[in-house]
């Protein structure tokens, strides 16, 4: 048993059906010694008396709030929590497996930049009585600052029969170096509370590896006289990292007809301009992605032929 | 050519060597982005690898100062590769395909070293950890560690030498 | 004051269904999860299984899974213990008893309902 | 499963008596052990909890004792309604067990 925050305890529980219950003291928290009786949860019904409760803590059953009393006083609570471990490995019934990019991925993180900043979502089918609480720090053994928010509901969707919710948080390095290789990597460590049952989910990256530049802005199309090329161009997003000759990034432009089976143009280039052909109810789309290090690319800007 | 004196090295063809460095290093092994080899514990030969940390000059502002103390490390980082790259890890069983860039990124570490440190000068360099992995298993695993530190390391050499390129040539 | 009141006797024919029922009553229903006990004629008692009233997770005897199904309804504070195809070995008095949180013994009992199968 | 044992299967005391029914676990069930009374026509009923703690409402005269695989239930001196059928039920392993019962008669 472990103290998550104040009168919040978590039970560790090896849950197989002949494994015994764990053995649980708990102590009021009073100056008092006699007089004490305990209840569970909304229960007025006396579990016990004393200044300490002994129980076997086997099933959610056993989980909950218990209040020890004295004349009708409250004196103190301890909310007990279960952290299932099933053949040995902690349960992760609350999150739902992201799979990508491989499975038992429950937290996925990016970046849009080298600043320290990133977001980190997940997503659960539980519409009700969760709660997360998000740490995260650089290294772990000696770990430096990284400060995140709270995390809230960010997106609702159907799927199938199931409402999925996704939750997200945005983290920020304290002391963050965008220009250094990144020796250590960031850990992120969610608390995920359901009823009674803990899980906690943990993420390890580095931030390059979580890079995921914004889409270019601004994309342009200038026809060029006489001819069927048009100039295409675009500037880096507002949210990229500066200065750009430092940070540079590489760019992947591509010309798609209305078709999807119709065969896709791409040039590559460093450069925030090309010059490509324009079909006629074409689009022209441009991604972006870091020039020296290859993470993610980022979302697709795109502008109409016509 | 970077004199330890203090004059600036040819930016340009260090910029051109040092993206060059970086898409030989992710041809080298692209798929690396996919495995988590931390999972795997670190083992010493990627905790001692030189990275070029925050106090190394090596951004925009301390390149403007004085880009010496970044080059230098940046040096000392190219020789240790070198040096890994030409190693048992890498000339080993299992061995590297015919074709492998495993060649092209060992040769393009030694070019991008000599142009920074010409013959004559000497910065001080790292030493390297004695690694001889008795399994072939556990040669594969270093190979992918020392690759994609090395594609860490050569996106910030590329950065400086692209900065360095655009805003210090004379 | 706590009570568990089951439904009454039933005689039944072998291969015929049954469901008898355990309402609670004078206590937190969620709280506490319910339990039955078989105590056949003249012999001892044997624990079939408990329920949580809140999310019907449930914990059977070995061996008496597959032969007897647990269920409960949280609206009406009842609790119910069913079988598909009853046989002569069924014969006995069940139980359902409240579960003691904290524990794991039952620290309160309904007056029992007795199930005769025969052909 | 844990197989729980009484003795005596059958005991035979008069009232005032000091009375003792001991149960023994196949293994160990820590202090997970109580002790039940069930009277002919009746339900059982709760008399002792975690081996020693007597339920609200059971008279002083109950007392239970042991940890491990040995315990025992103690009437200190027997009143005309203690005599009945008494149960041992351990619940520290799934499937919980009862004890086959200690039928406890006048003499």
């Known amino acids: 048993i472990w103290e998550l925050k104040k009168d919040v305890y978590v039970v560790e529980l090896d849950w197989y059906p002949d494994a015994p219950g764990e053995m649980v003291v708990l102590t009021c928290d009073t100056p008092e010694e006699d007089g004490i009786t305990w209840t569970l949860d909304q229960s007025s019904e006396v579990l016990g008396s004393g200044k300490t409760l002994t129980i076997q803590v086997k099933e959610f059953g056993d989980a909950g709030q218990y209040t020890c009393h004295k004349g009708g006083e409250v004196l103190s609570h301890s909310l007990l929590l279960l952290h299932k471990k099933e053949d040995g490995i902690w349960s992760t019934d609350i999150l739902k497996d992201q799979k990508e990019p491989k499975n038992k991925t429950f937290l996925r993180c990016e970046a849009k930049n080298y600043s320290g900043r990133f977001t980190c979502w997940w997503l659960t089918t539980i519409s009700t009585d969760l709660t997360f609480s998000v740490k995260s720090s650089r290294g772990s053994s000696d770990p430096q600052g990284v400060t995140c928010g709270a995390a809230t509901l960010s997106a609702e969707r159907v799927r199938g029969d199931n409402k999925e919710y996704e939750y997200s948080v945005e983290c920020q390095e304290d002391s963050a170096c965008p220009a250094a290789e990144e020796s250590l990597p960031i850990e992120v460590m969610v608390d995920a509370v359901h009823k009674l049952k803990y899980e906690n989910y943990t993420s390890s990256f580095f931030i390059r590896d979580i890079i995921k530049p914004d889409p270019p802005k601004n994309l342009q199309l200038k026809p060029l006289k006489n001819s069927r090329q048009v100039e295409v161009s675009w500037e880096y997003p507002d949210t990229w990292s500066t200065p750009h000759s430092y940070f540079s990034l590489t760019f992947c432009v591509q010309v798609q007809g209305k078709s999807k089976r119709e065969k896709k143009d791409r040039v590559f280039t460093d450069k925030t301009s090309a010059t490509v052909i324009c079909r006629k109810n074409a689009s022209i789309s441009v991604r972006a992605q870091d020039r020296y290090y290859s993470s993610s690319w980022s979302e697709w800007a795109s502008v109409p032929c016509s | 050519r970077a004199v330890p004196g203090g004059s600036s090295p040819a930016w340009t063809q260090c910029q051109q060597l040092s993206q060059k460095l970086c898409t030989l290093a992710w041809s080298a092994h692209p798929l690396v982005g996919h495995m988590d080899l931390r999972e795997e514990g670190d083992e010493e030969t990627t905790n001692d690898v030189p990275h070029i940390q925050c106090g190394d000059g090596c951004d925009p502002q301390g390149l403007r100062d004085n880009s010496q103390f970044c080059l230098q490390r940046i040096h000392q980082g190219l020789i240790f590769y070198e040096k890994l790259l030409g190693s048992d890890i890498f000339t080993g069983e299992p061995s590297l395909l015919p074709d492998s860039p495993v060649g092209q990124l060992h040769a393009s570490l030694l070019g991008l070293s000599q142009l920074l440190q010409p013959e004559g000068h000497h910065w001080e360099t790292q030493q390297i950890p004695s690694l001889s992995p008795s399994q072939p298993w556990q040669r594969l695993l270093l190979r992918f560690k020392i690759l994609r530190s090395l594609q860490a390391f050569v996106a910030v050499a590329a950065r400086v030498f692209a900065h360095g390129a655009a805003t210090l040539s004379p | 004051e706590v009570q568990l009141v089951q439904s009454g006797a039933e005689v039944k024919k072998p291969g015929e269904s049954l469901k008898i029922s355990c309402q609670s009553s004078g206590y937190s229903f969620t709280t506490y999860w319910i339990g039955w006990v078989r105590q056949m004629p003249g012999q001892g008692l044997e624990w079939i299984g408990i329920m949580s009233p809140v999310d019907s997770d449930i914990r059977y005897n070995p061996m008496f899974r597959g032969q007897v199904t647990m269920s409960v309804d949280k609206s009406s504070s009842t609790a119910y213990l069913q079988w598909s195809s009853l046989k002569a070995s069924d014969t006995a008095m069940y139980y359902c008893a409240r579960r003691r949180p904290g524990q794991g013994y039952f620290d309160f009992w309904g007056q029992g309902t007795m199930v005769t199968v025969s052909s | 499963e844990i197989v729980l044992t009484q003795s005596p299967a059958t005991l035979s005391a008069s009232p005032g008596e000091r009375a003792t029914i001991s149960c023994r676990a196949s293994?160990?069930?820590?202090?997970?052990l109580a002790w039940y009374q069930q009277k002919p026509g009746q339900a059982p009923r709760s008399l002792i909890y975690?081996?020693?703690n007597l339920q609200s409402g059971i008279p002083a005269r109950f007392s239970g004792s042991g940890s491990g695989t040995d315990f025992t239930l103690t009437i200190s001196s027997l009143e005309p309604e203690d005599f009945a059928v008494y149960y041992c039920?351990?619940?520290?392993?799934?499937?919980?067990?009862f004890g086959q019962g200690t039928r406890l008669e006048i003499k």
């Open positions: 039920q351990q619940y520290n392993i799934y499937p919980y067990t």
């Open positions: 293994q160990s069930v820590s202090s997970w």
């Open positions: 975690s081996a020693s």
